[in-house]
Interface confidence: low
């Protein structure tokens, strides 16, 4: 079989299977139109020359008027595919060149087809990822916000129950304060009692104050950190970033959890051991009710 | 060194009155707390009350507040707790304790008998 | 009132064994983070020793073979490796809420 033939054959298989590619089809008529014109008018300029050597020379014409017209005229594809079709019957050096480059269009098409099948296989989990994240993110968030209902309900308990604890306290301490004015009618004790009484009033309002602002503190620093998530406006690419920033951004955060909770623990252990060191003193500066208030930490 | 030093053992006949101290050393007196604990024979503890030795002030557990009364001598650093119309519920033995129940006396221990 | 509730009311644990009480509370005994549940060790005809404070700390002194943990109602005192000397009775007692409470105590013996 020759050189000739071979292409012949392989053409033809080439034909059937780019027949079975139809979104292509249109543009590769376009082109085998143009590849057409050209290699007629290579031809007959071939056959018109009397030497051999003018025959090669024309043949390099050829050539160029082939190639030429396909660089300028060229429509752009309308597809990921690339010109694949070589000429009908090349002769001599033309089907080693063409054999070559049709082999390697061949090869780059394949290529770039698995490259867009794992572009998309990426994509599509990476969407999915993405579902899952802003999901996890939901969900944690609600259950932060129960949580903190939660705690406040128990707190607007808590300081209930030492209202109420520490009105009646108040009140024994009262009671007893007219049975020891009346058993010992003295003015000057009256009057220590009474400012001792002011004093702590003044003290209890002086921390409720302090407490007040370190909450203001607290509240304004959580909602510095609370950023807004936009993302409507952004492209794959720039989701794809926003997630593995967000992811980053959720390591981090955990990270610093971890490492406050150390950290917590630590000095609560040194402020329990203060705190049940000077418990008790604190409790003697202060009426009881008030000193179970003032007497622990925010 | 903080110690609290307690009265002697206590034989008193029911429907009496009995006052046990409790005296302080090693601290400052104005500073903490004087709690008092009973425990009855081969039982629990129980939580009486709290004293400021600084001014007086008390709180009772309420089952005792009708049994027993707390006191304070600055003068003396002493803690004082009486405990009146006496039945046979209440032998046990009391103690003083301070500081958030860290610093404990040795204990009193009453007997009520005919 | 709070009530604490102790158990075993009694265990025998052998020399070099883990010895491990529970207490539980009628209602949270936590505050902000930290639960203000104590343990205490009495031995016969000696007042009560305070061992841990707010739930977990061990009290200076106290040999680090006692270990407490939990927090809001459910409570444990460990003892690993229990210790010929340990054999006495214990007692939880929260310091949150007026009245303070004791448990009713557990009473340890070494086999």
């Known amino acids: 079989m020759s050189d000739i033939e071979e292409v012949v054959e392989e053409y033809e298989e080439e034909e059937q299977e780019e027949a079975a590619v139809e979104e292509e089809e249109d543009w590769r008529e376009d082109e085998d139109e143009q590849e057409e014109a050209a290699e007629e008018d290579a031809e007959a300029e071939a056959e018109t020359e009397e030497t051999r050597a003018e025959e090669d020379e024309e043949e390099e014409e050829a050539k160029e008027a082939e190639d030429g017209p396909m660089e300028e005229s060229k429509p752009k594809p309308r597809s990921f595919m690339p010109n694949l079709v070589p000429p009908k019957i090349p002769d001599g050096e033309r089907v080693d060149f063409d054999d070559i480059h049709r082999k390697r269009m061949e090869k780059d098409l394949n290529e770039l087809q698995a490259l867009i099948e794992a572009h998309f296989e990426n994509r599509k989990k990476e969407e999915e990822e993405l579902v899952s994240l802003k999901d996890r993110i939901e969900r944690r968030r609600a259950e932060r916000a129960e949580q903190q209902r939660i705690r406040n309900e128990r707190e607007k308990e808590r300081q209930n129950r030492l209202a109420e604890e520490r009105a009646r306290r108040e009140e024994e301490e009262n009671r007893r304060k007219a049975e020891d004015e009346a058993r010992k009618k003295k003015a000057l004790s009256n009057m220590m009692h009474f400012g001792g009484y002011i004093q702590k009033q003044a003290q209890t309002e002086r921390k409720s104050g302090k407490r007040q602002t370190e909450r203001e503190k607290k509240k304004k620093i959580l909602a510095e950190r609370r950023k807004v998530l936009a993302i409507d406006h952004l492209n794959e690419d720039q989701l794809r970033e926003k997630a593995k920033e967000l992811w980053q951004s959720i390591y981090n955060l955990e990270a610093e959890k971890f490492d406050l909770q150390e950290k917590f623990k630590q000095q609560k252990y040194e402020i329990n051991v203060l705190r049940n060191r000077i418990n008790d003193n604190q409790k003697v500066s202060k009426t009881r009710g008030k000193a179970k208030v003032t007497g622990r930490w925010k | 060194e903080v110690q609290l030093q307690q009265s002697g053992p206590e034989l008193v006949k029911p429907g009496a009155s009995v006052k046990m101290s409790c005296k302080a050393s090693?601290?400052?007196?104005?500073?903490?707390?004087m709690k008092w604990v009973k425990q009855s024979h081969g039982k629990s503890l129980e939580w009486i009350g709290d004293?400021?030795?600084?001014?007086?002030?008390?709180f009772y557990n309420q089952k005792f507040k009708d049994k027993a009364t707390l006191t304070v001598d600055k003068s003396s650093s002493t803690a004082y707790m009486q405990l009146n119309s006496l039945t046979s519920e209440d032998s046990a033995v009391y103690y003083c304790?301070?500081?958030?129940?860290?610093?404990w006396g040795q204990g009193t221990t009453l007997t009520v008998s005919s | 009132d709070i009530v604490l509730t102790q158990s075993p009311a009694s265990l025998a644990v052998s020399l070099g064994q883990r010895a491990t009480i529970s207490c539980k509370a009628s209602?949270?005994?936590?505050?902000?983070?930290?639960?203000?549940m104590n343990w205490f060790q009495q031995k016969a005809g000696q007042p009560p020793k305070r061992l841990i404070y707010?739930?977990?700390n061990l009290e200076s002194g106290i040999p680090a073979r006692f270990s407490g943990r939990g927090s809001g109602t459910d409570f444990a005192l460990n003892i690993h490796p229990v210790e010929e000397e340990d054999a006495a009775t214990y007692y939880c007692?929260?310091?949150?809420?007026?009245?303070?409470?004791f448990g009713g105590g557990t009473k340890l013996e070494i086999k």
């Open positions: 090693g601290y400052t007196f104005t500073d903490y707390y």
């Open positions: 304790a301070t500081r958030v129940f860290d610093y």
């Open positions: 209602q949270s005994v936590d505050y902000d983070g930290t639960s203000y």
């Open positions: 007692q929260q310091s949150n809420e007026d009245p303070y409470t």
């Open positions: 004293i400021n030795p600084n001014n007086g002030e008390t």
């Open positions: 707010a739930a977990s």
